[in-house]
């Protein structure tokens, strides 16, 4: 149906109801104007990574799915004028960083949400005239610093905040006439703003109060912008901010209840009516509850998030819900309740956390829940509960703690006493260990039976801080805060290392690459990692991300050939770095950047021939540097090190030269500066890129061909990882 010419596809005026399939991937201009398209789906423009101009005006588009423009990385101009858009999806332009012209005029848009243009930072021309806009959320235009043309005329705007426009230095055309501007104290700023820009915002007039109706805003004196006494004192002249409210597509909203049960949602809907008292979000696929997800809904009394996939809850996910009576979170994947999660939920009567994977409770988790009547923690992974966890629950009548793997040691004695005094646990919670108490009801065991073995169980001792979270991993041994996984033929770090771990022993295993799994982000107490006696050849960038408390790493006896600073990213507190007995041949000038806390660095027994100038310059705390047992080539490239070793008061054990022959076994710092020479072809600097190819040769992967080149000496810069070297047909008199 469409016509294609070069990179232009023309489908205009064809009465199309949907965007046609199979638009060529190389399309740069697409004309779909003058059709009957009603909806833009997130797959309609998928893959059109070269599209620059998209014409969608004069259709009947009422819905644009979020992500519809995500692939349009090159999009520069988009025309959506003369459609039926009412709701403006947030984050619609997240992928269109090059968009500079956007026409949304002549639609029925009622509000501009705060994140409307997030991602489209290059917009220069934005047309929003002839809509029904009554609300522009604060910050909606904040990212649009390059805006030159903004048309908001012929809308229903009554109020605007100064924050919306005071960051547009390039604005040259601005139209705001034909709105319903109410010229009270909240709009006083606009008069000044327009006077400072006499060429923009022409004919902008007040529509109220009645005595200012028809007056040009720029001509009204500041003292005439007044509010009633009650309003004047309100929030120090803050304009009541509007917010964009709607019932999410697929949900039903009535009587202040938003019902989104079983709608396949993957995230919490935003911008719901602020008066809602109940949200039903059960049986969806929500994974994350972000910060302040429900904070606008001050009247919320019941929130049901059961049977989702929730594994991550922001600490302030439920902030501000002072009227909340019921919070239903059962049937999710919650492993931990962040600190302060339930802070301020003073009205909560029911808290259902059953059927999750909660492995610990902070001692203050429930401190504000004075009116809680029922707490269900049934079917979780709790091994212990710290004394005092339930002390704030003054109104508690029913508690479900069964189906948890409780360790009934001395740290759980208090719970038995508590349940004897308050027989509120109605689900029949039982011990899992020790074996002598296994399967017995906690509330029926005599308290003297709750004992600890000689070495107190750290897992339960630290439970109030949520370090009692995980059992000892299979193949490891856990004693105190040491987790010993040595000699187990491991080639990767076990999952579920306990959070309380301070020392992690992974030595004498089969590691070859230390992968960036993010494991250390979950180990806030970690101080020492032993990775000695493995087969590590590489450490991925970010492997130690999150290990900010680690102060000792042992990488002795591995197979590292080079060291780069990216390997050690995240080790801000590292004091000891042992790299003994590896295969390091060169130390670059940025090998150790970012390790400003390191005091002891051992490079003993490697194959280091050279060290780039300044290699240790960023190690501000260095006091011991072991460079012994390395075959240093004391040529001109190493002169700086002799000088540095003399100047620095660092214990080094006097590393010695191995080359050239006349300096063999001489301590580097004893070599006179003029003796560091690159004579007789000795200018090897093995820190030069390993992959370079001698100019006389050709290199393919690790094969180097230098045949028939009339060579008398070995060419310089042969890659160190060479596997095949062809030197036939040359003029060598000696074997090089």
């Amino acid at each position: 149906q469409c016509s294609c010419s070069g990179s232009t596809v023309d489908c205009h005026g064809l009465a199309l109801r949907i965007v046609p399939r199979n638009i060529p991937r190389n399309t740069e201009r697409l004309d779909l104007n003058g059709n009957n398209i009603t909806r833009i789906t997130k797959t309609d423009f998928a893959g059109l990574r070269h599209l620059r101009i998209l014409q969608l005006m004069e259709n009947k588009i009422s819905t644009i799915e979020r992500g519809a423009f995500h692939d349009l990385k090159e999009l520069e101009r988009l025309r959506l004028n003369r459609n039926n858009l009412q709701l403006f999806p947030e984050l619609l332009f997240l992928g269109t960083a090059k968009l500079y012209r956007l026409d949304l005029s002549e639609n029925q848009i009622q509000a501009i949400p705060r994140k409307a243009f997030r991602g489209a930072v290059d917009i220069k021309n934005l047309q929003l005239d002839y809509n029904q806009i009554s609300c522009i959320e604060d910050g909606a235009f904040r990212a649009l610093r390059d805006l030159e043309v903004l048309t908001l005329n012929n809308n229903n705007i009554t109020r605007l905040s100064v924050a919306s426009f005071n960051h547009m230095p390039k604005l040259r055309t601005f139209r705001l006439h034909s709105n319903n501007l109410y010229c009270d104290c909240h709009l006083a700023w606009l008069s000044d703003w327009l006077r400072q820009r006499p060429r923009v915002g022409l004919y902008t007039q007040c529509m109220g109060p009645s005595h200012l109706r028809g007056h040009n805003v720029a001509e009204v004196q500041k003292r005439e912008f007044v509010c009633s006494d009650e309003e004047e004192g309100h929030q120090s002249f803050m304009a009541p901010s509007c917010s964009v409210l709607h019932c999410p597509i697929a949900c039903t909203c009535s009587n202040n209840i938003v019902d989104c049960r079983g709608k396949g949602l993957t995230e919490i809907p935003t911008n719901l009516p602020e008066t809602i008292t109940e949200i039903r979000l059960e049986q969806n696929s929500i994974r994350v509850i972000p910060p302040g997800a429900f904070s606008p809904y001050k009247k919320l009394r019941r929130l049901d998030l059961s049977n989702n996939q929730i594994s991550e809850l922001a600490p302030d996910a439920f902030q501000g819900l002072r009227s909340l009576n019921s919070l239903v979170l059962y049937g999710n994947k919650i492993t931990e309740l962040p600190k302060s999660l339930f802070e301020g939920l003073f009205s909560l009567q029911l808290l259902l956390l059953n059927a999750n994977k909660i492995n610990c409770l902070r001692v203050d988790a429930f401190q504000d829940l004075h009116n809680l009547n029922l707490l269900s923690l049934y079917d979780n992974k709790l091994q212990t509960v710290a004394k005092g966890t339930f002390s704030a629950l003054r109104a508690i009548q029913t508690m479900h703690l069964a189906q948890n793997p409780f360790i009934c040691d001395c740290h759980l004695k208090w719970l038995a006493d508590y349940l004897h005094t308050n027989p509120i646990e109605t689900s029949g919670a039982r011990c899992t260990s020790p074996r002598r108490l296994a399967n017995k009801r906690i509330g029926q065991i005599k308290s003297k039976k709750f004992r600890c073995s000689g070495t107190e169980d750290y897992r339960s001792k630290l439970s109030g801080d949520c370090f009692a979270d995980l059992a000892c991993p299979e193949k490891c041994r856990c004693e105190g805060t040491t987790v010993d996984c040595s000699n187990q033929k491991l080639n990767k770090i076990p999952d579920h290392i306990p959070q309380y771990t301070a020392e992690l022993r992974l030595n004498n295993n089969e590691f070859t690459v230390l992968e960036a799994t993010g494991i250390f982000k979950k180990l806030p107490q970690l101080r020492k990692i032993n990775l000695s006696n493995n087969k590590i050849t590489d450490i991925e960038e970010g492997a130690f991300e999150g290990a900010s408390g680690v102060n000792e790493i042992l990488l002795t006896s591995n197979r590292l050939e080079n060291v780069q600073h990216k390997m050690f990213k995240g080790l801000e507190s590292l004091k000891t770095l042992m790299l003994r007995s590896n295969r390091i041949s060169c130390v670059g000038n940025d090998s150790f950047t970012g390790l400003g806390s390191v005091r002891l660095l051992s490079l003993y027994d490697n194959q280091i021939t050279t060290v780039a100038p300044g290699a240790f310059g960023t190690l501000h705390s260095l006091s011991t540097l072991n460079l012994l047992a390395n075959p240093f080539n004391c040529n001109c490239h190493l002169a700086w090190l002799g000088e540095w070793l003399r100047r620095k008061r660092i214990v080094t054990g006097n590393p010695r030269c191995q080359k050239p022959y006349f300096l063999k076994e001489i301590p580097i710092q004893d070599v006179a500066i003029q003796d560091f020479t690159c004579d007789d072809g000795n200018d090897d600097n093995s820190c030069s890129p390993l992959s370079r190819c001698p100019s006389e040769c050709t290199c393919l992967d690790t094969v180097v061909r230098c045949s028939n080149k009339g060579l008398k000496v070995l060419p310089k810069g042969i890659p160190r990882d060479v596997t095949e070297l062809y030197l036939d047909g040359n003029q060598f008199t000696l074997v090089p």
Epitope: D259, R301, R302, S323, N325, S326, Y330, L348, S376, H400
Partner: antibody, heavy 118, light 107 residues
Amino acid sequence: QVQLVQSGAEVKQPGSSVKVSCKASGGSFRSYTVSWVRQAPGQGLEWMGGIIPIFGTANYAQKFQGRVTITADESTDTVYMDLSSLKSENTAVYYCATGSGWYTFDYWGQGTLVTVSS
Amino acid sequence: DIQMTQSPSSLSASIGDRVTITCRASQNINSYLNWYQQKPGKAPKFLIYAASNLQSGVPSRFSGSGSGTDFTLTISSLQPEDFAIYYCQQSYRSPPTFGGGTTVEIK
């Protein structure tokens, strides 16, 4: 929103028991609290007890402990109130009610009149 | 149990009148007080929760106030459909308890 539909009026002999049902329509109430409140003729309202269907365990007012049993059938979204050892002073309208917390009653059934008379 | 006392037990008023009903708790219940309206032969209807919050669909002429032990329900301008019995109820502690009711009749 949830609508609560109760079973019909009952006339019972003293000493017998009565079982009143309350069915939810317009949405499951498996994780809601469902309470029973009674009102004797010309009298005020009196809370008897409540249940959360997914747990099955009920919570009773001291006054009714031992004589009232509240149960739930999740599969049919129905809650039952069983009152035994009936006396003439148990003649009342029995309401089921549900709400956002244990003790707030947003929605009410239409009521079931139980008359105890020989 | 917490006792709830309503006053007056009945009152007569005309259409358009401002009507005030009070409710007193035998101990501090913070703001955990609800108001219900009941018409003859009907189930109670939820009006106000947490002392001052209007339930959805309830006309704005109804308002509630108070905290601690003393609470008030006010009807700013009585309408024909407002003639009924009004109950307060505390939701602070078990068992929840109701006031004895206030009957609002036509004068």
